[in-house]
Interface confidence: low
Amino acid sequence: GVTQTPKHLITATGQRVTLRCSPRSGDLSVYWYQQSLDQGLQFLIHYYNGEERAKGNILERFSAQQFPDLHSELNLSSLELGDSALYFCASSV
């Protein structure tokens, strides 16, 4: 299945964190979503085989990439209180 690390993260405002996602074996696509109490579930970004394919409601302070082994990282910088949320990764062929 899809593996995300870390499972939990507590940090301070202004900091930068990296969330990692390993897709299911053989899957080429990785999707990142943010679920917050006030905004609900929002699509952030989609990568296919290392290339950005679609961008959703992703802030300039957030960036992502997908590596040749297809794992992906979501970088959140200059963190604000409003960034407190669940971050989901999904994968597909």
Epitope: S25, G26, D27, L28, N49, G50, E51, E52, R53, Q65, F67, P68, D69, L70
Partner: antibody
């Protein structure tokens, strides 16, 4: 037909900069990553990293962080490699290469440029 | 990084002969090995990927075999245009790494 055509040979002194280009034709440029590979005289091939032609995001191998910059002129289907503060050990042939889009385990190169020889000498 | 060891470094043969080039990985790379041909002033040419899959347009006299750590490129019935440098490359994991090369010369 698919081609990657690289710029001509370069002669530079230590400390100077050089910018190499790689013009792609025969395919949709933004559908494939462009990689750079170094080959020092009499040596083997060493992968330098790649640039995502869709987003412009570069990724560098550990040994090529710092003085090496990958960039794009997407409208011209061209990828560039700039090397600053040149050193004698940068003397080499630099290849651009296209990676096939096969996904998992897909870090291979199905089309290559002809290579550019860069000489760094005082 | 995965280290790739190629052998032999040099190989002399005549047209019509068959030759084999070996490549050994420092750890298992499953089946994910590519072979390239290099000639001066020409773009490198992908011959084989996934250890044994022939790239489109490459003559069937080229074949690849092996999995895990040991791989072989075989050329049966050498043609004059086959002489040059050959490199293996693992495409199992980041970063991609190459063997040191094998020079195939005319005997």
């Amino acid at each position: 037909q698919i081609q990657l055509v690289q710029s001509g040979p370069e002669l530079r002194e230590p400390g100077e900069s050089v910018k190499l280009s790689c013009k792609a034709s025969g395919y949709t440029f933004t559908d494939y990553l462009v990689h750079w590979v170094k080959q020092a005289p009499g040596k083997g091939l060493k992968w330098m990293g790649w640039i995502n032609t869709y987003t412009g995001t570069p990724t560098y191998a550990d040994d090529f962080e710092g003085r090496f910059v990958f960039s794009l002129e997407a409208s011209a289907s061209t990828a560039n490699l700039q090397i600053s503060n040149l050193k004698n050990e940068d003397t080499a042939t630099y290849f651009c290469a296209r990676s096939w889009r096969r996904g998992l385990r897909g870090i291979g190169f199905d089309y290559w440029g002809q290579g550019v020889f860069v000489t760094v000498s005082s | 990084d995965v280290q790739m060891t190629q052998s032999p470094y040099n190989l002399a043969a005549s047209p019509g002969e068959s030759v084999s080039i070996n490549c050994k990985a420092s750890k298992s790379i499953n089946k994910y090995l590519a072979w390239y041909q290099q000639k001066p002033g020409k773009p490198n040419k992908l011959l084989i990927y996934d250890g044994s899959t022939l790239q489109s347009g490459i003559p069937s006299r080229f074949s690849g075999s092996g999995s895990g750590t040991d791989f072989t490129l075989t050329i049966r019935g050498l043609e004059p245009e086959d002489f040059g440098l050959y490199y293996c490359q693992q495409h199992n994991e980041y970063p991609p790494t190459f063997g040191a090369g094998t020079k195939l010369e005319l005997k």
